[in-house]
Interface confidence: low
């Protein structure tokens, strides 16, 4: 499973990560695939 | 406008000790994760530390070359970052970049600074 | 550690043509994958993101493609500026690991 700060739950209400984030219920995205250095 | 600048590095001996600093401007520092990436002459590029944002408890992560050797830390009021580097070895020569990152979820902001050398020779 | 191998080492192509770079994972990274171009003297800038999203302000001759272990850069017309070194990264699993980089020369 992914284990780096890129998995880590973003706090930006109502985002959707263009590189295939899930909006959960509460609204807030999750960052997936898409960290940079 | 956005800037990173690296400072502290120069020459040292092996088994000595320095500090990296790196300062940023023209964006919110606080919200940033940062990482330092080092590239030896001619080499090519390599993580070494990483330290999340301030939200995320400034957790850190290293390369298993530096554990227990390098210090990475921030000061988010100073806008400011830092790489405590001790027993330094011949194989940390290199250039020295600190870059951040910072996801707002339709997009990305990845910014560099231009580096700072590091030389570990007697 | 996942290891990145880039190919090729390097490739010589002349203004115009299509650029193909690989990149291949020892392990699944999904796609966290990101390309960087590094010119002489001048630290790395960042091309894409997340496998195929291209950073503000690249342009789109620039695109990713890939997923799980094998990735590919494509340069679809080059232009003078983009001869430079590649490097491939993933950020799926610490320790974050780049590629060896390929050098795109001018033929």
């Known amino acids: 499973a992914c284990d780096t700060a890129t998995c880590v739950t973003h706090r930006l209400a109502g985002l959707l990560s263009r590189s295939g984030g899930v909006v959960k219920n509460n609204f807030v995205p999750t960052n997936v695939g898409s960290k940079a250095f | 406008e956005v800037q990173l600048v690296e400072s502290g590095g120069g020459l040292v001996q092996p088994g000595g000790s320095l500090r990296l600093s790196c300062a940023a401007s023209g964006f919110t520092f606080s919200n940033y994760w940062i990482s330092w990436v080092r590239q030896a002459p001619g080499k090519g590029l390599e993580w070494v530390a990483e330290i999340r944002s301030e939200s995320d408890a400034s957790a850190t992560h290293y390369a298993e070359a530096v554990k227990g050797r390098f210090t990475i830390s921030r000061d988010n009021a100073k806008n400011s970052l830092y790489l405590q580097m001790n027993s330094l070895r011949a194989e940390d020569t290199a250039v020295y970049y600190c870059?951040?990152?910072?996801?707002?979820?339709?997009?990305?902001?990845?910014?560099w600074g231009q580096g700072t050398l590091v030389t570990v020779s007697s | 550690e996942i290891v990145l191998t880039q190919s090729p080492a390097t490739l010589s192509l002349s203004p115009g043509e299509r650029a193909t770079l690989s990149c291949k994972a020892s392990?699944?990274?999904?796609?966290?994958v990101s390309w960087y171009q590094q010119k002489p003297g001048q630290a790395p800038r960042l091309l894409i993101y997340g496998a195929s999203n291209r950073y503000l302000g690249i342009p789109a001759r620039f695109s990713g493609s890939g997923s799980g272990t094998d990735f590919t850069l494509t340069i679809s017309s080059l232009e003078p500026e983009d001869f430079a070194v590649y490097y491939c990264s993933q950020s799926y699993n610490y320790p974050y690991t780049f590629g060896q980089g390929t050098k795109l020369e001018i033929k």
């Open positions: 870059t951040s990152y910072f996801d707002y979820g339709l997009a990305i902001q990845n910014y």
């Open positions: 392990k699944r990274v999904t796609t966290y």
